[in-house]
């Protein structure tokens, strides 16, 4: 059961897990819902009847029966992880706590301007977890406008005490804000040779790299396959970190593989949802239930349902005992990983999803597409949605892309003459426009948020936000695109899709059938080559075949680039502009998503 | 049933004004806009303007924008239409009618003008 | 502005005639336009939506094709009751215009 209020002057007795501390109730729960195995916590606020040394705590806790005995304390809040609860989890915090001192290791002290400018270079340091920074108003002379940047094992302040004059607050990696690099690959044959600062069980390096992107000091990781000729160490995940940030020494070795912390990439990417099953493998750890279940699939149902089931392990049936049905191991550990990984017993074993949704929506696999044509099929591209005028009479006026539950990212010039966002109708889920009926449910559009420096298409900044008067349920139709990650802007997309009703020629109408066309994409120097008359900004982007006969045209703007990469695909571009539709040497330009990836988080993460 | 009664017949001197109304039911008159439409006697139809009534957003054409305004009450469903500085002219059916999702759908019965000294 | 110029502005035919009436638009109008009947004393009716869409419950002896700039309403088989004005209309573009209207009589 979902429980999201906290209970002021209540503390649940026992059950003690570890305590940390936070500098508020709010960020106790988020801590608890990341946390393995936490159901439950009391958090200690300030308060004169208190002693001050347990302010701040945030005691997580777990139950066998997912309860515990509440006894009542002043300035005891308490509350239930989210794990119990099925909407999306984000573990960002934006908040700034005002005459909070977080304690940690003070690895890096500046100066800084104001105390956005010291999260940012929070955000922007690999190690940072947290910083505080002392105000102009500080008492001491020396550290005013000094910007502390923190880190600590667990990735929340060893302490918190009150200061009066500095602000405090945390970094916003977890936002999708950092500039830090994404590298994504994973090196074969590779040992990195730095300090180890955790070690756990994973069955492949996927999950070890996801491991070492949602553990707060881990910066890289090796991980030895179960070929590794040492036998006590294969399946063996050691997750590392270095001063530098990178790995000092690289070592090849036969059956290992390296990689680093997708931290700077976790929105575009699951990082918490290890969905694979993993055959003739059994996870050891401690043993929750045992049930009877169908299949594999089941079993993981099974656990994914069972909140304390944190990993599983299904032994088919043999011949035709028990109705068909196999034993499904439930089971968790004290950190989420099964304490050891053996092969060869025929069992099939993998990890509950309920962590699924602690990632992006928009990582999530979408079904196989249709290669070739040019008719798209339903489900294909779920993020694109038609977005009508109702103004003269209704009509389709442009395309879009879902980002978020109540977000919509086009283009500003779709808003040309339009008065009010009353008029507009976003429809998501369509594949023809012959579907849109007058009784056709559809979102209305409560905000059009459009770049405020953009005045023409040509010119750029051709973009515009969507917000809905009600949120989207995401379903197999209907779900967010990822934004392409900061990290990523030096990664070269081979796989990318243009999409919409628009015509398909300069002199044509609507289509029915939403239309996709794949579309390489050109560099900024050979785009500017072919207008001469304008200029290609680094915030715009351009596709387009040399010999043009495939193209975005009138009635596909604002509606998406889609490009592919690391089966995750991502809001690349929005359909902008060009000369005529699918001309020789005339690629289409599209406004440039990763550009304005701080302009879209600045308004839809708005309070 | 959609139904969209207009107000009684009107006989004004040059230069008054009137003011037409139109009373919706039978939908949800917010979502809907709602145009005028001009039939001198013996006529074509001439559209003057539409209004939506969720945002009061309005568009004219240019030969009635300085003299007709086009109003919306929720709260009982009903639209408005003002014209000034009335002439012969002016004397015409006013209809008012709703443009559901692909035309002009529901028309009222229409209110008489007629402009004389 | 954009102008709709329909012919012819009457005609008289016998009843289970074929019956067409055109309306041309001085620009593209892609398929934005709708066809009325207005019968003596009576309010316009909607017959055809988007140059070629029957609206509901008008008889199938109605038809309406065409797109961009030429359009056409058609009745198969002329009856009594469809003794009326005809208006095309356009819906593409501000101002919204109309053609001049054909008087359709029985012979």
């Known amino acids: 059961e979902c429980v999201t209020q906290l209970l002021k002057d209540t503390c649940f007795e026992g059950g003690d897990i570890t305590t940390v501390f936070t500098p508020s109730a709010k960020y106790c729960q988020v801590v608890c819902t990341y946390h393995p195995r936490c159901l439950l916590f009391t958090f200690t606020a300030e308060s004169p009847s208190e002693d001050p040394t347990r302010w701040f705590t945030c005691v997580l806790k777990d139950s066998v029966t997912e309860t515990l005995p509440r006894v009542n304390r002043t300035a005891a809040i308490s509350g239930y992880s989210f794990k119990q609860c099925s909407h999306q989890i984000s573990a960002c915090n934006k908040d700034i706590y005002v005459d909070l001192d977080m304690k940690g290791i003070n690895y890096n002290s500046s100066v800084a301007k104001s105390a956005q400018e010291c999260q940012e270079r929070c955000t922007d340091d690999v190690h940072c977890h947290f910083f505080t920074y002392a105000t102009r108003q500080f008492p001491s002379l020396e550290h005013r406008n000094i910007c502390l940047l923190k880190h600590t094992q667990t990735g929340t302040p060893t302490r918190i005490t009150k200061l009066d004059k500095v602000v405090s607050g945390f970094s916003l990696k977890s936002c999708a804000l950092s500039n830090l690099a994404c590298i994504r690959d994973i090196f074969p044959n590779t040992v990195f040779a730095d300090s180890n600062i955790d070690s756990v069980m994973a069955p492949d390096a996927f999950v070890c790299g996801r491991i070492c992107t949602h553990h707060p000091g881990c910066l890289f990781f090796t991980f030895f396959s179960q070929e590794w000729p040492k036998e006590s160490q294969r399946n063996l995940c050691l997750l590392k970190t270095s001063e530098s940030g990178l790995p000092s020494t690289r070592i090849k070795k036969s059956k290992a593989l390296s990689g680093f912390s997708l931290q700077s990439c976790r929105h575009s990417i699951p990082v918490f949802c290890h969905s694979s099953f993993y055959h003739d493998t059994d996870f050891l750890g401690e043993e929750l239930d045992i049930v009877a279940a169908k299949s594999h699939e089941a079993c993981q149902k099974l656990c994914t349902n069972a909140v304390r089931c944190q990993f599983f392990t299904y032994t088919p049936a043999q011949a035709s005992c028990n109705e068909g049905k196999g034993k499904c191991y439930l089971k968790l550990s004290s950190n989420g990983s099964p304490t050891k990984i053996l092969h060869g017993r025929g069992g099939i074993s993998g990890y509950t999803l309920r962590l699924c949704k602690m990632d992006n929506e928009c990582t999530t696999k979408i079904k196989p597409r249709i290669v070739g044509g040019t008719a798209s099929v339903r489900g294909e591209w779920p993020w694109q949605v038609t977005l009508h005028t109702t103004s003269p009479t209704q009509r389709h006026l442009c395309g879009g892309s879902i980002i978020g539950n109540q977000w919509i990212l086009t283009a500003a010039h779709c808003f040309y003459g339009v008065e009010s966002p009353k008029i507009l109708r976003v429809y998501s889920g369509i594949l023809n426009q012959s579907e849109i009926k007058e009784d056709t449910s559809f979102f209305g559009v409560q905000e059009i948020i459009i770049h405020d420096q953009y005045k023409m298409a040509e010119s750029g900044y051709d973009i515009a936000l969507l917000k809905l008067e009600t949120t989207v349920n995401y379903t197999d139709s209907q779900r967010p695109i990822c934004l392409p990650s900061k990290g990523d802007r030096n990664v070269i997309y081979t796989d990318c899709w243009v999409t919409g009703w628009g015509y398909r020629k300069l002199r044509d109408k609507i289509q029915n059938t939403l239309q996709k066309a794949k579309i390489p994409l050109v560099t900024n120097e050979e785009c500017q080559k072919r207008y001469r008359g304008h200029k290609i900004t680094h915030k715009m982007i351009c596709a387009g075949y040399r010999e043009g006969g495939k193209d975005a045209c009138k009635g596909d703007s604002g509606g998406p680039l889609s490009c592919k990469h690391n089966e995750v695909w991502h809001l690349v571009g929005i359909t902008s502009w060009g000369e005529g539709c699918a001309q020789r040497e005339r690629p289409g330009v599209y406004t440039n998503v990763v550009e304005y990836v701080d302009w879209i988080l600045e308004k839809t993460q708005a309070v | 049933q959609v139904q969209l009664v207009q107000s009684g017949s009107e006989l004004k001197k040059p230069g008054a004004s009137v003011k037409l109304s139109c009373k919706a039911s039978?939908?949800?008159?917010?979502?809907?806009?709602m145009h005028w439409v001009k039939q001198a006697h013996g006529q074509g139809l001439e559209w003057i303007g539409n209004i939506y009534p969720d945002s009061d957003s309005t568009n004219y054409d240019e030969k009635f924008r300085t003299r007709a305004t086009l109003t919306a009450d929720t709260s009982t469903s009903t639209a408005y239409m003002h014209l000034s500085s009335l002439t012969s002219e002016d004397s015409a059916v006013y209809y008012c009618t709703r443009m559901g999702f692909y035309a002009m759908d529901y028309w009222g019965q229409g209110t008489s003008v007629t402009v004389s000294s | 502005n954009i102008v709709m110029t329909q012919s012819p502005s009457s005609l008289s035919a016998s009843v289970g005639d074929r019956v067409t009436i055109t309306c041309k638009a001085s620009e593209n109008v892609v398929t934005y336009v709708s066809w009325f009947q207005q019968k003596p004393g009576q309010a316009p009716k909607l017959l055809i939506y988007g140059a070629s869409n029957r609206y509901t419950g008008v008889p199938d002896r109605f038809s309406g094709s065409g797109s961009a700039t030429d359009f056409t309403l058609t009745i198969s088989s002329l009856q009594a009751e469809d003794v009326a004005d005809y208006h095309c209309?356009?819906?593409?573009?501000?101002?919204?215009?109309f053609g001049q209207g054909t008087k359709l009589e029985i012979k």
């Open positions: 209309g356009q819906s593409y573009s501000y101002p919204l215009t």
């Open positions: 039978g939908y949800t008159f917010t979502r809907y806009w």
